[in-house]
Every structure is written in structure tokens, then in C-alpha cells.
């Protein structure tokens, strides 16, 4: 597996990556062009200067490379038969490797689609699950809470493991695990609701392994704009998977005449994807794309990683901003369909709902909008960032900040428009969500820039934990609580049902504005933190010649 500089040209040529690589080589005092296109530790197939697989020594904290005997003690930078031939020898850039990395990113993205497809298939048949098991609303809330809590708790654990052990094995095991659990859960008898709760908790653990580790592999396969693009594809999987989950849930239920079959689709696809990950995703070294040769030193302790992340201001502020996004999406996703239904009751275009599901049509429209705006947001965000990077080095956090602040305006306008026009409200939702979702991939990219490769899985995990804890774990309940509080002090009428929920939801744009402020704060520290991370990577790299085995 060759690093980005070798393969990106084959995949369409990335001049800026080459220039960036050249700059870094000069910083390390390497001769320009030495070793041809200085690539990262590839597993060779024998041959001069290429390290074969058996020359790699696995340790608990990573792997070190034995220098093949009979070779000069040069940094084992693959590509490296070329180094033996001399600097003038042009290095061929095999297209297959570019395709291989593209395929790896595609499979990882497919895995993410399945992650969310599985999660939202359950949402798609939740009413059937509630009906079958006799689950009350508090029970449905328990299912969601158990999932989020187990996900939150498991994420830092997998972050720790992901920075220290074989990531693709952890990924595949995670997929196999949640697939098996979801499949088994389709056979749970009616009297064992607690087993269903347990299964959702276990699925949360399985999915946490994927969500925390997969982005770091993409981060190690690509850099700069290519990485932004690939992360965009990876994060587009969220709305795509969510939308497909709803569709799969309802359509499989209708086709089979039994909701149980809906829970048997994603596990089968999951098993296939897990196998493909094992076969096709390369066992990339941490910092593969960033470091250009050499070998990263042994991993630091988890406590030291946490201290470093907490001191990393760009990381902290972007994580808080992500929490704000999570808060808003969690609350809006839960309450907007009901809010719009109540708006129609007030406008006398719909009847008061006494028997749930209330606002089913609005849920469907909102789901479709979320799915499409997720795609549009990711594309818009990535495109805007690429364009802005030509003008400022702080493009990433600034694009996020603008997106958040713009989103807050349109979220506010939802509540203005809903009083008179449902179509107007939907337009505001469309624009607001597009802007809100525009920072998904960019936030991940910011993390890749400011966190060193050996800490990335822990960083993703901690960010995931924080965004759930401060975001969607509590926001739906908080909005409901505020709405009930307002209603207690007003007269019981459809108008006040509508207004109280609207006033409660007004908390969302304020939180989004706060998130925008956090992104602006990220912009202040972004360049210094990025430089620090690059400097740390350079310090972490040591030539394998000096490694005592």
C-alpha cells in the first residue's frame, strides 16, 4: 500500500499534495526528490529496498520495522527500489494503488451507510416494535437512551483500541458483532422486551467501533483536498443510510408482511461489508499519508492522549461546536414533524391528532428533506472549503462558522413561517439543514489536521462522546420539558400547544449560534494547532535504522 503522493497522481494528480510533500521533506532535511516519490511504509513483495511482510515486528503499541540486512541504513521509505537506483530515476505511480485506496474509502463509506441504515431501520419500524412488544413511550425512549449511552461509553474505549491495535480487524469485528446482534434481535419473543433493550445497547457498542475508527483510516489514506472529498463521501453516508433505513424498514415490512424481516436485511449486508473490509481495506500505518517514510514511535498512554486533546484548543472548540450541531439535529429531528402538524391544526388544514402516529406525513417529508440536505450540505461544505482554501488557510473552521450562523437564521425563520405557511417552513428547514450539515465532513477534516495520527481514533471517540452527551442525548427531552413547562402556565388549546413547542424549539438556533462562535474560536487557534500537530508528527517519526528490535 503506497501513500497518497504515490497514488493520488494516478487517481487524477494532486499537485498541491506533491508540493506539500516536498516542503515537508525539506523541513526534515531530505534531498529533494530523494527516494523518488517518498512513500510510506508499504508491504513489499521482496525485491531490493522493499520491506517484506516478515520484516515487520508487531508490538502492542504498533509495529516497528527491521532493516533488511545487506541494505544501507536509509529510512525505509518505500518506493524505494527507486532510491537504490538514484534520485534521477523516475518513479512510476501505479494506478491500481490509487484505485485500491479509492475502493478502500468506498467500502468504509458503504460500512457507514450500513451503520446508519441499521440504526434507522429500527426507527422505521419503531411503531411496529412498540405495538408488538407493548412498549410505552418511556420504553421507546429507553431504547434510544440505551443505544446512545452504550455508544457514548464504547466510543472512547474503541478510540483507545483504534490508536493501538489493528484497526481493520476491530472494524470488521464491530460490523460482524452488530450484524449478529441485530439479526438475533429479530427473533426476540414478545415477553423479553429487556432483551431488545440489551440488543440495542450491544448494537450501540458495535456501531461505536465503526464510527470512531473508520474516519481515521481515511485520514491515513489521504491528505488535503482528497481527504476532504473522501471524508465528505464517508459522512454523506449518514443521511443516505438514515433515509435508506426508513425506506428499508417500511418497504421490507410491507413486502414480507412482518416487521421482523426488516431487521434481517442490514445484518446480511453487514456481514458482506465486514468481509470486504477485511479483504480490501489495507492495514495502513497511522499517519501513513501524513508522515512520508519512517516509523511512528510507540504510542503514548491514554491519559497523556486525553491531556493533549484537552489542551488542543482547536479540537476542544470544534468538539463543542459539533455538540451544538448534534443538539440541534437531535431536537429538530424529534420535534419538528409534530410542530408542523400542530401548525397545520392552528391553520385549520389538519385535524387535532388523538391517536398516534401524529404528523406521520410531516415525518416522511422531514425525513426526505434531511436525507437530501445531508447530501447537499456535505457537497456544499466540501466545495466551499476547497474554494476558500485558495484564499485563506483558516478556511475549514470559517466555512463551518458561516454555515452555523447562516443555519441559525433559517432555523429561526422556521418558527416565523410556520404560523402562516407550511411550505415556507419547509423551505426554511431545507436551507437551515443544508447549512447545518455543511460542516460534517469539514469538522472531521479539522480533527485530522490538528490531531496527530496516533491520537486520532481517541480524538474521534471523545468528540463523538461529547457531541452525544452535550447534544442529542438530552436535547429532545429538554425541548419537551420546556414545552410542557410553558404549557402549564397557559390555557389548554391547540394554539398554545403549537406556540409552546415553538418557543421551546427556539433554543435550537441559540445553541447553533453558540456553535458558530465555537467554530470562530477554532479559527483563532487552527493554524497554530495545525503547525503543532505537524511538528509533533515530525518529532514522532524516527528512521527504522535506529530502532532496536
Amino acid at each position: 500500500m503506497m501513500c497518497l503522493e504515490c497514488a493520488s497522481a494516478a487517481a487524477g494528480g494532486a499537485e498541491e499534495e506533491e508540493a506539500d510533500a516536498e516542503r515537508r521533506r525539506r523541513r526534515r532535511g531530505a534531498q529533494p526528490g530523494a527516494g523518488g516519490s517518498a512513500c510510506c511504509g508499504a508491504r513489499g513483495v521482496g525485491g531490493a529496498g522493499v520491506v517484506s511482510a516478515d520484516e515487520e515486528v508487531q508490538t502492542l503499541s504498533g509495529s516497528v520495522r527491521r532493516v533488511p540486512s545487506g541494505l544501507p541504513s536509509i529510512p525505509s521509505t518505500p518506493g524505494c527500489a527507486a532510491a537504490a537506483k538514484g534520485p534521477s530515476a523516475p518513479q512510476p505511480k501505479p494506478a491500481s494503488l490509487g484505485r485500491g485506496r479509492g475502493a478502500a474509502a468506498a467500502i468504509l463509506s458503504l460500512g457507514n451507510v450500513l451503520n446508519y441504515l441499521d440504526r434507522y431501520t429500527v426507527a422505521g419500524v419503531l411503531l411496529d416494535i412498540q405495538q408488538h412488544f407493548g412498549v410505552k413511550d418511556r420504553g421507546a425512549g429507553l431504547l434510544q437512551s440505551v443505544f446512545i449511552c452504550s455508544f457514548m461509553v464504547a466510543a472512547p474505549i474503541f478510540g483507545y483500541l483504534g490508536d493501538r491495535f489493528n484497526r481493520k480487524v476491530i472494524l470488521s469485528c464491530g460490523i460482524f458483532f452488530w450484524s449478529a446482534v441485530t439479526f438475533s434481535s429479530s427473533f426476540i419473543p414478545q415477553q423479553y422486551f429487556w432483551l431488545l433493550v440489551l440488543s440495542r445497547g450491544l448494537v450501540g457498542i458495535g456501531e461505536a467501533s465503526y464510527s470512531t475508527i473508520a474516519p481515521t483510516i481515511i485520514g491515513d489514506l489521504f491528505t488535503k483536498n482528497t481527504r476532504t472529498l473522501m471524508l465528505s463521501v464517508f459522512y454523506f453516508a449518514i443521511p443516505l443510510g438514515s433515509g435508506l433505513g426508513y425506506i428499508t424498514g417500511s418497504s421490507v415490512k410491507q413486502a414480507a408482511g412482518d416487521w421482523h424481516w426488516a431487521l434481517r436485511v442490514s445484518p446480511v449486508l453487514g456481514m458482506i461489508t465486514g468481509t470486504l473490509i477485511l479483504i480490501l481495506v489495507p492495514a495502513t500505518k497511522r499517519g501513513h499519508a501524513d508522515q512520508l517514510g519512517g516509523q511512528l514511535k510507540a504510542r503514548t498512554s491514554w491519559l497523556r492522549d486525553m491531556k493533549a486533546l484537552i489542551r488542543n484548543r482547536s479540537y476542544v472548540f470544534s468538539s463543542l461546536a459539533t455538540s451544538a450541531v448534534s443538539f440541534a439535529t437531535g431536537a429538530l429531528g424529534m420535534w419538528i414533524p409534530l410542530y408542523l402538524h400542530r401548525a397545520q391544526v392552528v391553520q385549520k388544514t389538519a385535524e387535532t391528532c388523538n391517536s398516534p402516529p401524529c404528523g406521520a406525513k410531516d415525518s416522511l417529508i422531514f425525513g426526505a428533506i434531511t436525507c437530501f440536505t445531508g447530501f447537499l450540505g456535505v457537497v456544499t461544505g466540501a466545495g466551499a472549503t476547497r474554494w476558500c482554501r485558495l484564499r485563506t488557510q483558516r478556511a475549514d473552521p470559517l466555512v463551518c462558522a458561516v454555515g452555523m450562523l447562516g443555519s441559525a437564521i433559517f432555523i429561526c425563520l422556521i418558527f416565523v413561517a410556520a404560523k402562516t405557511s407550511i411550505v415556507g417552513a419547509y423551505i426554511c428547514i431545507f436551507v437551515g439543514e443544508t447549512l447545518l450539515f455543511s460542516n460534517w465532513a469539514i469538522t472531521a477534516d479539522i480533527l485530522m489536521y490538528v490531531v496527530i495520527p496516533t491520537r486520532r481514533a481517541t480524538a474521534v471517540a471523545l468528540q463523538s462522546f461529547t457531541s452525544h452527551l452535550l447534544g442529542d442525548a438530552g436535547s429532545p427531552y429538554l425541548i419537551g420539558f420546556i414545552s410542557d413547562l410553558i404549557r402549564q402556565s397557559t390555557k389548554d388549546s391547540p394554539l398554545w400547544e403549537f406556540l409552546s413547542l415553538g418557543y421551546a424549539l427556539m433554543l435550537c438556533p441559540f445553541v447553533v449560534v453558540l456553535g458558530g462562535m465555537f467554530f470562530l474560536a477554532t479559527a483563532l487557534f487552527f493554524l497554530s494547532d495545525r503547525a503543532k500537530a505537524e511538528q509533533q508528527v515530525n518529532q514522532l517519526v524516527m528512521p527504522p535504522a535506529s530502532v532496536k528490535v
Epitope: 412498549v135 410505552k136 414478545q190
Partner: antibody, heavy 125, light 107 residues
Framework: EVQLVETGGGLVRPGSSLKLSCATS????????MSWVRQAPGKGLEWVAL??????????NYAESIKGRFTISRDDSKSRVYLQMNTLRDQDTATYYC????????????????WGQGVMVTVSS | DIVLTQSPPTLSVTPGESVSLSCRAS??????IHWYQQRSNESPRLLIK???QSIAGIPSRFSGSGSGTDFILSINRVESEDFSVYYC?????????FGPGTKLEVK
């Protein structure tokens, strides 16, 4: 001790209305799902209607044979469940039982763990 | 709707004998079956829930088994108070349905 007491039965003409009431005691009514089950003379049991608790938005479910004619409702403050029967037919003649579903806080069983003594409704011209 | 068939409609036994009452569902319903006893001029009472789970206060001679479509209610050494009608009920899906009943009578 759990108690379910039905009242409101009697003899009515086809097409007329009747409201059955079930007074409950000995358990937390507001958290419990309640149903009406009927039994025509010399025949088997037939489920009529179910009303869930407020934590399930007091959702109601009905048997196809009575849908649109009967309405189940509850009053948590009085611990009572009702069955409003409109457009009554001859085939609605039966003993109507008020039943309780076993409750497990987060979920409820669909089976009936307690039954009232029943109330007779006769529809005849 | 899920249809339940009980057999035999009537079962004549002598006290002290052991019997098995059958209930068959029109489709697979896992273990979502429940058994009730209705003595003459009385309200029904729950005997067994979820195919095999016993109920507090119900004599241990009553037991249930089965899964999928075929279910059995067994009465070990029938006593005089057991002569009544037995109904099975499914809760796998709405509408909730009952079997037509099996009448246990003295031989």
C-alpha cells in the same frame, strides 16, 4: 386487591346507544392498559377494544367488527374506563368484561391478568 | 387476522387422569400464546402466559409448552374443580384473538 366492576348494561333496541363503565381499584390505574372483552351467550370470547395509558398517548385499538361504532375512553382521575356503544346490533348481545393488562412500567402485556364479573348487554327489538 | 384452532372441542376425562389440550395458530406466533380457564357462570382467569410461564396462585399441575404454531396446555392429574372451558389467546399481533375453546368434562 385488584377489583374491576362493570356497570351500565341492560336491554336496548337495535340502533340505540349505551355506555358501559368500569370502576377499578387496587392498582395504579393511570399506568395500566385496559380492554373490553365480550362473550355472546353460549359462545367464545371476543376482544372488543383496548386503551393504552397516557405514556402511550392513550392510544385506542378496536376489533374490526365494532370499529366506528364503539369508542373506548378512560378517566385517570376517577380510575374508570368506558365503552361507548353506538348503533347497536343484535349480534352485539353479550356479556361485556372489563379487563386489565399486566403492566411492566416500560411495556405492557397484551394478555389479561384480571377480569371483572361482566355486565350483560341485550340488543333486541 | 391470526386464527386460533383448539382441539378437541370437548374432552371427557376422569378425575386423576392427565390431559393435553391443543391450540394451533394460522401462522407462526413465537411464544405469544396465553391460556385462560372459565368455569361455569364465572369470569375467565389467566392460567399460563407466553406459552409456558406460570402465574402466581395457579396450581402447579397446569403447565404449557410449544412455540411457533403448535401449543399445548397440560393438566397433570385432573381435579374436580378443573372441569371447565379452556381458551387460548394470541397476542402476537392486533387484533387480539381467542380460540373457540375446549370444554373439559367429566367422563
Amino acid at each position: 386487591e385488584v377489583q374491576l366492576v362493570e356497570t351500565g348494561g341492560g336491554l336496548v333496541r337495535p340502533g340505540s346507544s349505551l355506555k358501559l363503565s368500569c370502576a377499578t381499584s387496587g392498582f395504579t390505574f393511570s399506568d395500566t392498559w385496559m380492554s373490553w372483552v365480550r362473550q355472546a351467550p353460549g359462545k367464545g370470547l371476543e376482544w372488543v377494544a383496548l386503551i393504552k395509558d397516557k405514556n402511550s398517548n392513550s392510544e385506542a385499538n378496536y376489533a374490526e367488527s365494532i370499529k366506528g361504532r364503539f369508542t373506548i375512553s378512560r378517566d385517570d382521575s376517577k380510575s374508570r374506563v368506558y365503552l361507548q356503544m353506538n348503533t347497536l346490533r343484535d349480534q352485539d348481545t353479550a356479556t361485556y368484561y372489563c379487563t386489565r393488562h399486566e403492566d411492566f412500567y416500560y411495556y405492557s402485556g397484551y394478555y389479561f391478568d384480571y377480569w371483572g364479573q361482566g355486565v350483560m348487554v341485550t340488543v333486541s327489538s | 387476522d391470526i386464527v386460533l384452532t383448539q382441539s378437541p372441542p370437548t374432552l371427557s376425562v376422569t378425575p386423576g387422569e392427565s390431559v393435553s389440550l391443543s391450540c394451533r395458530a394460522s401462522q407462526g406466533i413465537s411464544t405469544s400464546i396465553h391460556w385462560y380457564q372459565q368455569r361455569s357462570n364465572e369470569s375467565p382467569r389467566l392460567l399460563i402466559k407466553y406459552a409456558s410461564q406460570s402465574i402466581a396462585g395457579i396450581p402447579s399441575r397446569f403447565s404449557g409448552s410449544g412455540s411457533g404454531t403448535d401449543f399445548i396446555l397440560s393438566i397433570n392429574r385432573v381435579e374436580s374443580e378443573d372441569f371447565s372451558v379452556y381458551y387460548c389467546q394470541q397476542t402476537y399481533s392486533l387484533p387480539l384473538t381467542f380460540g373457540p375453546g375446549t370444554k373439559l368434562e367429566v367422563k
